[in-house]
Structures are given as structure tokens and as C-alpha cells.
């Protein structure tokens, strides 16, 4: 799903207040709901009819440093007999997410939000046949 | 997928530098890759064998203000005849994502990262059979 454009109004102070100095704002240390847990069914990436593998990308100047991307294993979907059904298609489910980019020059450290497109998993679909002449 | 705990080291300055004052840091305005596009306007939520609906939550003090959550429509999966196959299960695919929480008291505005659990879509899986002896 798509993150709407920020328009930067979200990060501005009310009009009656003095503007933010130097085009930056104050970000408090600590993360709300940091201990929240994901309760995804076990091994769904292998048990799905549209199975996928995971690839981990690592960047020490990004939070989270580890971003996991899914890749569908097949073009078709896996049927009850374990064979590939090519009349159906395994398609990626994608999600825009925010990460924090760290920028530093010596002891001057600043941070910036960055949009990242993550493939979270795959699902099996019936293609809509709209042939363009 | 799970975002690892921050440990807050990511947001700290190098040890040789003076500490961050007041437990906050500088966040630059603007978002990297803001114009990146998601090519998801294809109604896969209706054409999946594990279809889902979307619910939008809105919070003006969160960026993005709009967070979309998916809910699987069925317990089973939809077969080629359009009927529900209860020998298979529709399960949610979840992703931890970051949002920015805005906190203000008068003209003093600060921001804090928040972890949010988003259900991005659903996939069809073969249930794990636990045989009880």
C-alpha cells in the first residue's frame, strides 16, 4: 500500500509559531511499541500455494538495519498435488514502509525518513485477461 | 517481518563525541524516495484465492496519517469454481512498519518513531496437521 506524499505540513509547527530552524526538527530517542510482536503463522512462506523465499538486506546507516524482501518462488501456484498450476499466478504483495537514514559528518549526526518498497509475501491470483489490441 | 530492537545505539553519536542533549536528535525535513511508486492498483485483494478487504485507520498526529489494514475475507481459500475450500486456510501476512508520532504542547513540537503492525494481505496455506497420539 502507498504512503501518501507528506507535503511537509505534518512536520511544520502551527502557523502562529516561529518556524523550525534549519529545516530540521526534534526526534525523541526511543520507539513507541518497540516490544510489539508479530504473530504470523509458522512457515507460511513454505506452506503457501504461492511460496516465497526471503532475502535480507543490511545497511548499518539505516534503521532498521535489516530489511527483509520476499521473492515468489514460482510463476504459477502450487496445487494440492504439489505441482505448479500455471493457469494461476503467484504475485508479490508489496508495502511502502518508512525507515530512518543516518547521515553523519564527524560528530554532527542527523537523520532523515526514507520510503522503502518491501515485498512482504506472495499470494495466488487469477489474472484478469484484458488483452489490448 | 519483525523490526529488531533498536537498543538506541543507532541514534547515539560516536563515543568520542558529546552526548545528544535532552534525549532527542535532529530529524531533517523531507523524505528520501518520496516519489517511489507502488504498482499495486490491480485489485489483487479481490482476485486472490485468499481474498481480503481493507480498513483505513486515520490519525492526524501520525505520519502517515492513513494506515491501511487488510482482513482476510474467508477462513478457507477460494477454488477455481469460486467456492470456499476449507481444506486450505487464508492467513494474514503481517509486517512491522515505522510511523512518526507527533507530540505537541503549544509551540513545542517533537516527534517520535512508533512501531505499527500492519496486515498487508492474505495468502492461502496448507494447514499444519498436528496428530495427537
Amino acid at each position: 500500500r502507498k504512503i501518501p506524499k507528506v507535503g511537509h505540513t505534518f512536520f511544520q509547527k502551527p502557523e502562529s509559531c516561529p518556524p523550525v530552524p534549519g529545516g530540521s526538527m526534534k526526534l525523541d530517542i526511543g520507539i513507541i511499541n518497540e516490544n510489539q510482536r508479530v504473530s504470523m503463522s509458522r512457515n507460511i512462506e513454505s506452506r503457501s500455494t504461492s511460496p516465497w523465499n526471503y532475502t535480507v538486506t543490511w545497511d548499518p546507516n539505516r534503521y532498521p538495519s535489516e530489511v527483509v524482501q520476499a521473492q515468489c518462488r514460482n510463476l504459477g501456484c502450487i496445487n494440492a498435488q504439489g505441482a505448479e498450476d500455471i493457469s494461476m499466478n503467484s504475485v508479490p504483495i508489496q508495502q511502502e514502509t518508512l525507515v530512518v537514514r543516518r547521515k553523519h559528518q564527524g560528530c554532527s549526526v542527523s537523520f532523515q525518513l526514507e520510503k522503502v518498497l518491501v515485498t512482504v509475501g506472495c499470494t495466488c491470483v487469477t489474472p484478469v485477461i484484458h488483452h489490448v489490441q | 517481518r519483525k523490526i529488531p530492537k533498536v537498543g538506541h545505539t543507532f541514534f547515539q553519536k560516536p563515543e568520542s563525541c558529546p552526548p545528544v542533549p535532552g534525549g532527542s536528535m535532529k530529524l531533517d525535513i523531507g523524505i528520501i524516495n518520496e516519489n517511489q511508486r507502488v504498482s499495486m492498483s490491480r485489485n489483487i485483494e479481490s482476485r486472490s484465492t485468499s481474498p481480503w478487504n481493507y480498513t483505513v485507520t486515520w490519525d492526524p498526529n501520525r505520519y502517515p496519517s492513513e494506515v491501511v489494514q487488510a482482513q482476510c475475507r474467508n477462513l478457507g481459500c477460494i477454488n477455481a469454481q469460486g467456492a470456499e475450500d476449507i481444506s486450505m486456510n487464508s492467513v494474514p501476512i503481517q509486517q512491522e512498519t515505522l510511523v512518526v508520532r507527533r507530540k505537541h504542547q503549544g509551540c513545542s513540537v517533537s516527534f517520535q518513531l512508533e512501531k505499527v503492525l500492519v496486515t498487508v494481505g492474505c495468502t492461502c496455506v496448507t494447514p499444519v496437521i498436528h496428530h495427537v497420539q
Epitope: N74, I86, S90, P92, P127, V128, H130 | R42
Partner: antibody, heavy 123, light 106 residues
Framework: EVQLQQSGPELVKPGASVKISCKTS????????MHWVKQSHGKRLEWIGG????????SYNQNFKGKATLTVDKSSSTASMELRSLTSEDSAVFYC????????????????WGQGTSVTVSS | QIVLTQSPAIMSASPGEKVTMSCSAS?????MHWFQQKSGTSPKRWIY???KLASGVPARFSGSGSGTSYSLTITDMEAEDAATYYC?????????FGAGTKLELI
């Protein structure tokens, strides 16, 4: 205009490997599947496999598993196929062919073809 | 895998003549697709989803059939129609092609 430009003819020795490429233009490479098809001396067409750059998904004909490896380079909008442990049976014309996007057309719905790459295996 | 058997293997026709070639599948398929190939060139998409003509294909061509039996028909043969025609299915893995029907001009 959709175009699939394949690499030139190859003469290779038995036991060797060869990698042939298919450079695309005129459409968004990531959004469509690329298939590879073998045609031995003007005869029957045999589907080797297909790969989708967006989903990462691949599908192979069992007859070519271990023989062919399909890859894509999104940055150059190029699909490639490597053939290994070549024998005289592998001498053929190999075509890349564009399939569907998986959303509006099936991944296996082939519409455009490259001009073909001739591979000759001979000592 | 689904085997597609095309008949006849070779046929000849005069200009203006009606031509019909067939494609028989070893198991039922939902759709059949056809490609045209002329000597020394790559195949071209010709008929898809059993009966839909690809862009630029003359209206004298038509496709029909269901289940295991499909056909391609040319109402009045023209010189430019001389080529090999291949049927193809992607109902079942792996995708397969027929051996082709070579249509020659008399």
C-alpha cells in the same frame, strides 16, 4: 514499440557453457515475464522456462532443470539464460519471448519474441 | 504434460481456397493459442484465447474449439499466409507447443 534484442550466434565446444542475453526496450521490463524457447533445426518449439523480474518467480520445464538457468538484470532491462554441460543435442535456435504481467495477463501468455540466438555445439 | 498433436503436418492450398488445420490436446484445456512462423524468422503471436486475433492479423483468420479439439481456419488463402502454424497451451505445466502445420502455397 516493444523490442527484444538477442545476443549474437555462438559456437561452443561440448561440455562448455554459454550465456545468451535478451535486451528489452519499449515497455517496463520489471512488470512482464520473460520466457525462453528452444527450436531445434526448424522443428518443434520447446518451452524452457520463464522468470518474472518483479515477483522474483521462476518456472522451468523439468526437461531443462539443471541445463538452463534464467536470470534478469533490472538495471539494464536485460534477461539472460545460461546453458551448461552442452552437447550436440543442445544445438538450436533459442528465443526469448515476453509473457504477461500476472495481473492483467497470465505470466505464460506470450506475445512478443526476440529474433533468436543460434547456438552450435561442435568440437 | 499435455501433448498437442497438429494435423496435417504439411498441407498445400491455392489462393482463395478455405484452409482448416487442427490441434488435438491429450487432456482438456481451457484455451488454445496459435503462432505463425515464416522461414528464418521468429514466431509471431497469431490467435490467442482460442479465437481472438492478435494485432495486425487479417480478419480472414479465425480460431475455434474447446476441450481437446481446436482449429485454425483461413477463409480465403493468400500468398502471405504460407507459413508454419504452431498451437500452444498454458493450461497445464509445462507450457507446450504442437509440432506445427506447414502451409504451402500451390
Amino acid at each position: 514499440e516493444v523490442q527484444l534484442q538477442q545476443s549474437g550466434p555462438e559456437l561452443v565446444k561440448p561440455g562448455a557453457s554459454v550465456k545468451i542475453s535478451c535486451k528489452t526496450s519499449g515497455y517496463t521490463f520489471n512488470e512482464y515475464t520473460m520466457h525462453w524457447v528452444k527450436q531445434s533445426h526448424g522443428k518443434r518449439l520447446e518451452w524452457i522456462g520463464g522468470i518474472n523480474p518483479n515477483s522474483g518467480g521462476v518456472s522451468y520445464n523439468q526437461n531443462f532443470k539443471g541445463k538452463a538457468t534464467l536470470t534478469v538484470d533490472k538495471s539494464s532491462s536485460t534477461a539472460s539464460m545460461e546453458l551448461r554441460s552442452l552437447t550436440s543435442e543442445d544445438s538450436a535456435v533459442f528465443y526469448c519471448a515476453r509473457g504477461g504481467d500476472g495481473y492483467y495477463t497470465n505470466y505464460f501468455d506470450i506475445d512478443y519474441w526476440g529474433q533468436g540466438t543460434s547456438v552450435t555445439v561442435s568440437s | 504434460q499435455i501433448v498437442l498433436t497438429q494435423s496435417p503436418a504439411i498441407m498445400s492450398a491455392s489462393p482463395g481456397e478455405k484452409v482448416t488445420m487442427s490441434c488435438s490436446a491429450s487432456s482438456s484445456v481451457n484455451y488454445m493459442h496459435w503462432f505463425q512462423q515464416k522461414s528464418g524468422t521468429s514466431p509471431k503471436r497469431w490467435i490467442y484465447d482460442t479465437s481472438k486475433l492478435a494485432s495486425g492479423v487479417p480478419a480472414r483468420f479465425s480460431g475455434s474449439g474447446s476441450g481437446t479439439s481446436y482449429s485454425l481456419t483461413i477463409t480465403d488463402m493468400e500468398a502471405e499466409d504460407a507459413a508454419t502454424y504452431y498451437c500452444q497451451q498454458w493450461n497445464s505445466h509445462p507450457l507446450t507447443f504442437g509440432a506445427g502445420t506447414k502451409l504451402e502455397l500451390i
